[in-house]
Amino acid sequence: GSTVPPMVNVTRSEASEGNITVTCRASSFYPRNIILTWRQDGVSLSHDTQQWGDVLPDGNGTYQTWVATRICRGEEQRFTCYMEHSGNHSTHPVPSGNSHHHHHHHH
């Protein structure tokens, strides 16, 4: 099939006091090969500080996956989710509050 770029969605949720969990979800993409990682100041976080979901079919002939990490509240500006898929890339910031979700298609 032809390339379908992912939709990328970054959310945040309260973790423990002083911390938040940020989750980056990529969905509706094809083929299944994708790089999805959290960066701090542009540098990829180590693997032991991130959790990844499996790359799974979403039922439409495309795939979905996610990556999450825990960060200190107040340091959100330092963190971005980096996505690379089929030769294209994008960077996604952490939204400023719980009610703000960012959805982006990338071509």
Partner: antibody, heavy 118, light 108 residues
Framework: EIQLVQSGAEVKKPGSSVKVSCKPS????????IYWVRQAPGQGLEWIGY????????IYNQQFKDRATLTVDKSTSTAYMELSSLRSEDTAVYYC???????????WGQGTLVTVSS | EIVLTQSPATLSLSPGERATLSCSAS???????LHWYQQKPGQAPRLLIY???NLASGIPARFSGSGSGTDFTLTISSLEPEDFAVYYC?????????FGQGTKVEIK
């Protein structure tokens, strides 16, 4: 091959501004942050700030946030650092660098000497 | 601000000798955020070791790094003529990003 090529040396008067350019090549310009660092003669390295070329986010060292301005021109894949209200203490070599996969500064420009003198 | 203090300021050694450079942080740093750079006169710094102990691409195995918490070490097992330079540690854990003041390794 990844390279970052900077603009040439500048001589400036106190109170004026300087704008240094940095043109990376060998990778996708918007995929990595561009950092700026300076080094006064015979001194150590001092971080000025960085810019994410994809989203345009800028993080400054507080010490420079009132005088430094970081920008990018995505159409030419060029990053810029402008420093205003120059004083003699700003005489230094200014470096651009690229954020790496596992470290803050993995490739560096050749440096631009800025001399501030009346 | 995390202050990195490097010692000694100058290390005078002969080719073939072992060099041990120290970097002490004012606050604890995760090993993922401590890096070393080498700078020769008239040149830009270059990445030597990332994340405390990992050799950057093209760096010979005589270089090694170790440490944790507030104390980190760069070791050159047997100095080659091209190793005489200034070495900087750098932390990326908290803003502002900071460098040590450098250790100059000079020929004795």
């Amino acid at each position: 091959e990844i390279q970052l090529v900077q603009s040439g040396a500048e001589v400036k008067k106190p109170g004026s501004s300087v704008k240094v350019s940095c043109k990376p090549s060998g990778y996708a310009f918007t995929s990595n942050n561009i950092y700026w660092v300076r080094q006064a003669p015979g001194q150590g390295l001092e971080w000025i700030g960085y810019i994410d070329p994809y989203i345009g986010r800028i993080i400054y060292n507080q010490q420079f946030k009132d005088r430094a301005t970081l920008t990018v021109d995505k159409s030419t894949s060029t990053a810029y650092m402008e420093l205003s209200s120059l004083r003699s203490e700003d005489t230094a070599v200014y470096y651009c660098s690229r954020s790496g996969e596992r470290s803050n500064f993995d490739y560096w420009g050749q440096g631009t000497l800025v001399t501030v003198s009346s | 601000e995390i202050v990195l203090t490097q010692s000694p300021a100058t290390l005078s050694l002969s080719p073939g000798e072992r060099a041990t450079l120290s970097c002490s942080a004012s606050s604890s740093i995760s090993s993922n955020y401590l890096h070393w750079y080498q700078q020769k006169p008239g040149q830009a710094p270059r990445l030597l070791i990332y994340r405390t102990s990992n050799l950057a691409s093209g760096i010979p195995a005589r270089f090694s790094g170790s440490g944790s918490g507030t104390d980190f070490t760069l070791t050159i097992s047997s100095l080659e003529p091209e190793d005489f330079a200034v070495y900087y540690c750098q932390q990326g854990g908290s803003l502002p990003l900071t460098f040590g003041q450098g250790t100059k390794v000079e020929i004795k």
